[in-house]
């Protein structure tokens, strides 16, 4: 009686179970009553990452430098190429099909989390007592200078964009 289901790594064709091709290989011909499944290795720049019955291998992803991409991990016959972004850029999606420049944190904001190849810069406002006077993709908010520890007095209070201005003691009103 012909089978209705096959074991793992097999497929049903013409009322019989044939072996699937292993990762890195494509199907050339199905098995018969007398012959095994015929498989062939994928060519250069091709891959198949599962046990399969595909007649064509997939092309490796191309990391287009014009889109800011570079190869993070070269593909094999069993794995696709993994792209990432050039330094200072990050992927626009999980598939990393293109890149955008890392965001800079404006004055008054500091970097909470530095960008990676897959995530943008996260900025946070500088709270009272801290400042950032630059637009930067890596600078955190800096604490205001303590004039007292320098034996000076505050001439002008700091803001979220400027440090305290210290001056000599005799400036005290």
């Amino acid at each position: 009686e012909p089978p209705t289901a096959c074991r793992e790594k097999q497929y049903l064709i013409n009322s019989q179970c044939c072996s699937l091709c292993q990762p890195g290989q494509k199907l050339v011909s199905d098995c018969t009553e007398f012959t095994e499944t015929e498989c062939l290795p994928c060519g250069e720049s091709e891959f198949l990452d599962t046990w399969n019955r595909e007649t064509h291998c997939h092309q490796h992803k191309y990391c287009d430098p014009n889109l800011g991409l570079r190869v993070q991990q070269k593909g094999t016959s069993e794995t696709d190429t993994i792209c990432t972004c050039e330094e200072g850029w990050h992927c626009t999606s999980e598939a990393c099909e293109s890149c955008v420049l890392h965001r800079s944190c404006s004055p008054g904001f500091g970097v909470k989390q530095i960008a990676t190849g897959v995530s943008d810069t996260i900025c946070e406002p500088c709270p009272v007592g801290f400042f950032s006077n630059v637009s930067s993709a890596f600078e955190k908010c800096h604490p205001w200078t303590s004039c007292e520890t320098k034996d000076l007095v505050v001439q002008q209070a700091g803001t979220n964009k400027t440090d305290v201005v210290c001056g000599p003691q005799d400036r005290l009103r």
Epitope: G110, K112, Q113, E124, P125, C126, P127, V128, G129, F130, K140, C141, P143, W144, S146, E148, V153, V154, Q155, Q156, A157, N160, L172, R173
Partner: antibody, heavy 122, light 113 residues
């Protein structure tokens, strides 16, 4: 101990100005911030502005910008809040409070004056 | 400006009850550099000036009874009175001090049931 003593109640006519004082003692007045907060009858707390007496640096809430002036006299450890162009909606209790002490790590208001009632009425 | 929203606006409770007041900020009050939440809680009784209870969201001000506690981080904060005492019937305010202008919640009145 830290103390903030405010001037007495005032009754003012609409269009006039009021100047409330806040005399500080028991801490270094010049480096600490003095904050001004008001509370209209039956209402919540509303921050108006602040001053660091030693530097004369001030911050004002947008709502009061141009109508409030906060000053301080370090020789008498007294801060002042002047509100001009008074209207009936300015009827409130005005409080001074101590903010940061110059350490930049304690911006909350740990000591308050007793409050000054300002009544604006024609 | 950072908006502070308190709830409920009033609560009726009995002596011995556990009372919880919440406060929500329109933006995070947690600063990553020092891992501090820039939030304070105050108590105000009729005709009196407000009194500081809690600062940095969870630090108890000196002299404040331990039945008061503060918790929360980022945008959501809670003031808890574990066992309400007769002297705790008052209005409670949250306030942020992250950046100017400082703003207060609208207040929560704790009334006798």
């Amino acid at each position: 101990q830290v103390q903030l003593v405010q001037s007495g109640a005032e009754v003012k006519k609409p269009g006039s100005s009021v100047k409330v004082s806040c005399k500080a003692s028991g801490y270094t007045f010049s480096t600490s911030w003095i904050e001004w907060i008001r509370q209209a009858p039956g209402q919540g707390l509303e921050w108006m502005g602040s001053i660091q007496p030693g530097s004369g640096s001030t911050n004002y809430a947008q709502k009061f910008q141009g109508r409030v002036t906060i000053t301080a006299d370090t020789s008498t450890s007294t801060a002042y809040m002047e509100l001009s162009s008074l209207r009936s909606e300015d009827t409130a209790v005005y409080y001074c409070a101590r903010g940061d002490d110059g350490s930049y790590v304690r911006w909350y208001f740990d000591h308050w004056g007793q409050g000054t009632l300002v009544t604006v009425s024609s | 400006d950072i908006q502070m929203t308190q709830s409920p606006s009033s609560v009726s409770a009995s002596v011995g009850d556990r009372v919880t007041i919440t406060c929500r900020a329109s933006q995070s009050l947690l600063f990553s550099v020092n891992q501090k939440n820039y939030l304070a809680w105050y108590q105000q009784k009729p005709g009196k000036a407000p009194k500081l209870l809690i600062y940095w969201a969870s630090s108890l001000q000196s002299g404040v009874p331990s039945r008061f506690s503060g918790s929360g981080s980022g945008t959501d904060f809670t003031l808890t009175i574990s066992s309400l005492q007769p002297e705790d019937f008052a209005t409670y305010y949250c306030q942020h001090y992250y950046s100017y202008p400082w703003t207060f919640g609208q207040g929560t009145k704790v009334e006798i049931k």
